[in-house]
Interface confidence: medium
């Protein structure tokens, strides 16, 4: 199967690596701009230089390109608890992350929020907290895991998944049936 190529990829594939087809003259291959720069003017002819200009403050290009504009630098989302790991430069976007003892929870592919790593109170650390994953806890006897916290079996109602873990205690628990809600 031949992969589907967009118009720009088709045009680029005719030229050797590091060059692109002049948009007005498909017999000319112009040299792409280095990262940190953008295309100001196409090369006037074969073997002549492409006019590339450095990205302005607040913008970047991270790879060789023939973009007419640099990309805007990302801003770390303070309301998501994000902190700036490294500032934006002309050739690299801002890098955002979380503070120490926090992990990234990705709500969607490009959106993450920082949460505190679980401390596994009333349990032990099974897997340590990682950059993109909370601590995995194992609970002590008399406790069950709910939303990665060790909760006393006295909070276990008969219809919940905790019943197996809290089997010896469950008979003493008073509470109404609770169809899967927690």
């Amino acid at each position: 199967l031949v992969p589907h190529l967009g118009d720009r990829e088709k045009r680029d594939s005719v030229c050797p690596q590091g060059k692109y087809i002049h948009p007005q003259n498909n017999s000319i291959c112009c040299t792409k701009c280095h990262k940190g720069t953008y295309l100001y003017n196409d090369c006037p002819g074969p073997g002549q230089d492409t006019d590339c200009r450095e990205c302005e403050s607040g913008s970047f290009t991270a790879s060789e390109n023939h973009l007419r504009h640099c990309l805007s630098c990302s801003k770390c989302r303070k309301e998501m608890g994000q902190v700036e790991i490294s500032s934006c430069t002309v050739d690299r976007d801002t890098v955002c992350g979380c503070r120490k003892n926090q992990y990234r929870h990705y709500w969607s592919e490009n959106l993450f929020q920082c949460f505190n790593c679980s401390l596994c109170l009333n349990g032990t650390v099974h897997l340590s907290c990682q950059e993109k994953q909370n601590t995995v806890c194992t609970c002590h006897a008399g406790f069950f895991l709910r939303e990665n916290e060790c909760v006393s079996c006295s909070n276990c109602k008969k219809s919940l998944e905790c019943t197996k873990l809290c089997l010896p205690q469950i008979e003493n628990v008073k509470g109404t049936e609770d169809s899967g809600t927690t």
Partner: nanobody, 123 residues
Framework: EVQLLESGGGLVQPGGSLRLSCAAS????????MTWVRQAPGKGLEWVSW????????YYADSVKGRFTISRDNSKNTLYLQMNSLRAEDTAVYYC????????????????WGQGTLVTVSS
Amino acid sequence: EVQLLESGGGLVQPGGSLRLSCAASGFTFADYNMTWVRQAPGKGLEWVSWIDQEGVFTYYADSVKGRFTISRDNSKNTLYLQMNSLRAEDTAVYYCAKDFSAAVMLRTSFDYWGQGTLVTVSS
């Protein structure tokens, strides 16, 4: 094209009620778990409630437990959030979201979101 369209938000007094709806299209609604998430002004996202494909299992954040009820009508491709005993701290933009998978996961990841509906609780 997947679309999620929330409605039902508005201004309500403390102690009042609202029912949010989320009309889904562009995917087989009955095949996916759904979630309500909210974002208070200037704050991060907060997971509110989750419901499985068939509407049998539901989960709630502690902050809304006993006051909010999530439900779905697969014949109408619609997700609901009944909000009672509303408090000032419930003021937020409420989003419905489609889960990536059918796995039971709290704080899961979403591949599609609605545009949100604003709920303001104020006297």
